[in-house]
């Protein structure tokens, strides 16, 4: 299973560039120790990145705003684009050192140059999730899971920026997947591709996963989607009654599922 | 050390409602999943739900929503589940498990026995 | 929900004998982005909590004795004892840690004669 905030569940590979990408513990930033940093990267098939591939990874445009473990017990981040508010207004890997107590607890940094999936858990108030390397074309046979997960209570209200799927009359080729739910099992919602905006959905609970899948074939240009909390005592928590339109398939139905 | 302390032995009368807790040290209250696991007599383990305290998410079993509900104290690094309306299906043995950061529980409370008796 | 089914529901075997146990999946609990199955394995002794023996489905946990090994993937898995001693007088539960909610098999209990 896996997750930003939580490292398994489901669909687990997040930002990544040249084989690195970035972990948090399935409790949020900064709750890994080195040793369960180098456990989880290598219980995924990978192994802590080294300062070299990061830089690697960083040089390709690789950007995260939070302190990882590496190789040797170092820790760092990534900085492509300067900002006041991450690195000190600096690019370049954010070094802090090999730390001499490794049960200081950072995110991690995992190299394993066989990954090829993308998405993550998710539970910020907002994001937009982007089809991978969106503007460009997204790959073949990509399977990309979001899950959002939010506080008991709140819903999610979920809006839909580009489109641009391949289109074919089922949906079978290249598609997005919503589902009500925690996982792609249960409250699906609709399945969804061509270039046509689908409408907006708010969530009946506080999590909801949207799935990317991609076949061998043709590609095209990507998607991006954006989510806002809405908190149990705002007027717009009504979820709209949406009907079939454009080139999806939807499912009036809504399921309560966490 | 990792712990997980939990409370003693409860009796509680038919509809009533219990509040069971899982003392963590400071660091595993924090830094992972506070999950609760219940088991009857001579049967085997039902997931009820996870907390996350450090951010306030809580998962619940679709099963337990109503009759279960998770709650923690920072102050205290103590999880509380609170079980309402009791009946003689609520008697069990209720265990709070630390998850890894791995698929897998890695440590685990020494359980708390709950008697429902009128 | 992922609905965990373990057979047989109990054994009495002899020291020093070989013991295979079943555990199978509703749905797959394979994790298609780094092809780990998300399956753990816990052993229950009388009057204490779960104790874990093997993660990822074949992943044994460390300080576990070798005699233990996990094995499968996708929906079908196994809990394997090469030689069981007489401390191995226990219940034994799969878990799924794939997806909300965790579920357990209902437990294989190994009895020694």
């Known amino acids: 299973w896996g997750f930003k905030n939580g490292i398994f569940h489901n669909s687990i590979w997040l930002e990544q560039a040249a084989g690195v990408y970035h972990r948090e513990a399935r409790a949020g930033r900064y709750k890994l120790t080195y040793a369960e940093a180098k456990a989880v990267c290598e219980f995924e098939g990978g192994r802590l990145a080294t300062y070299k591939q990061l830089e690697a990874a960083r040089k390709i445009g690789f950007h995260v705003c939070a302190a990882g473990w590496m190789a040797k017990g170092r820790v760092g981040y990534p900085i492509v684009k300067p900002g006041p508010n991450c690195g000190f207004g600096k690019t370049g890997i954010i070094d802090y050192g090999i730390r001499l107590n490794r049960s200081e607890r950072w995110d991690a940094y995992c190299y394993n140059p066989h990954a090829k999936e993308c998405g993550g858990v998710f539970t910020d108030p907002k994001r937009i999730f982007k089809s991978p390397g969106f503007p460009n074309e997204y790959d073949d046979n990509q399977v990309c899971y979001w899950h959002i997960r939010l506080k008991y209570g709140q819903r999610i209200h979920l809006s839909f920026l580009d489109f641009d799927l391949e289109h074919d009359p089922g949906c079978l080729a290249d598609y997005v997947e919503i589902y009500d739910s925690y996982d792609d099992v249960h409250g699906f919602v609709g399945r969804y591709c061509g270039d046509e905006l689908p409408e907006d959905i708010i969530s009946t609970g506080n999590v909801m996963t949207l799935k990317f899948l991609s076949d061998a074939s043709v590609t095209a240009g990507g998607f991006q989607i954006k989510y806002v909390t809405v908190d149990p005592a705002s007027k717009s928590s009504q979820a709209k009654n949406t009907s079939t339109t454009g080139n999806k398939k939807f499912l009036p139905g809504r399921f309560s599922h966490l | 050390q990792v712990q997980l302390q939990q409370s003693g032995a409860e009796l509680a009368r038919p509809g009533a409602s219990v509040k069971l807790s899982c003392k963590a040290s400071?660091?595993?209250?924090?830094?992972?999943?506070i999950n609760w696991v219940k088991q009857r007599t001579g049967q085997g383990l039902e997931w009820i739900g996870e907390?996350?305290?450090?951010?306030?998410?809580?998962f619940y079993n679709e099963k337990f929503k109503g009759k279960a509900t998770l709650t923690a104290d920072r102050s205290s690094s103590t999880t509380y589940m609170e079980l309402r309306s009791l009946t003689s299906e609520d008697a069990a043995v209720y265990f709070c498990?630390?998850?890894?950061?791995?698929?897998?529980?890695?440590?685990w409370g020494q359980g708390s026995t709950l008697t429902v008796s009128s | 929900d992922i609905v965990m089914t373990q057979s047989p529901s109990s054994l009495s075997v002899s020291a020093g004998e070989k013991v295979t146990m079943s555990c199978k999946s509703s749905?797959?609990?394979?994790?298609?982005?780094?092809?780990?199955?998300?399956l753990a394995w816990y052993q229950q002794k009388p009057g204490q909590p779960p104790k874990l023996l093997i993660y990822?489905?074949?992943t044994r946990e460390s300080g576990v004795p070798e005699r233990f090994t996990g094995s499968g993937s996708g929906t079908d898995f196994t809990l394997t004892i090469s030689s069981v001693q007489a401390e191995d007088l226990a219940v034994y539960y799969c878990?799924?840690?794939?997806?909300?909610?965790?579920?357990f098999g209902g437990g294989t209990n190994l009895e020694i004669k």
């Open positions: 498990a630390r998850h890894s950061n791995l698929p897998y529980f890695d440590h």
């Open positions: 400071d660091d595993t209250f924090i830094n992972y999943g």
């Open positions: 907390t996350f305290p450090s951010n306030g998410n809580t």
């Open positions: 749905q797959s609990l394979l994790n298609s982005g780094n092809q780990k199955n998300y």
């Open positions: 990822g489905a074949s």
């Open positions: 878990q799924n840690d794939h997806s909300y909610p965790f579920t």
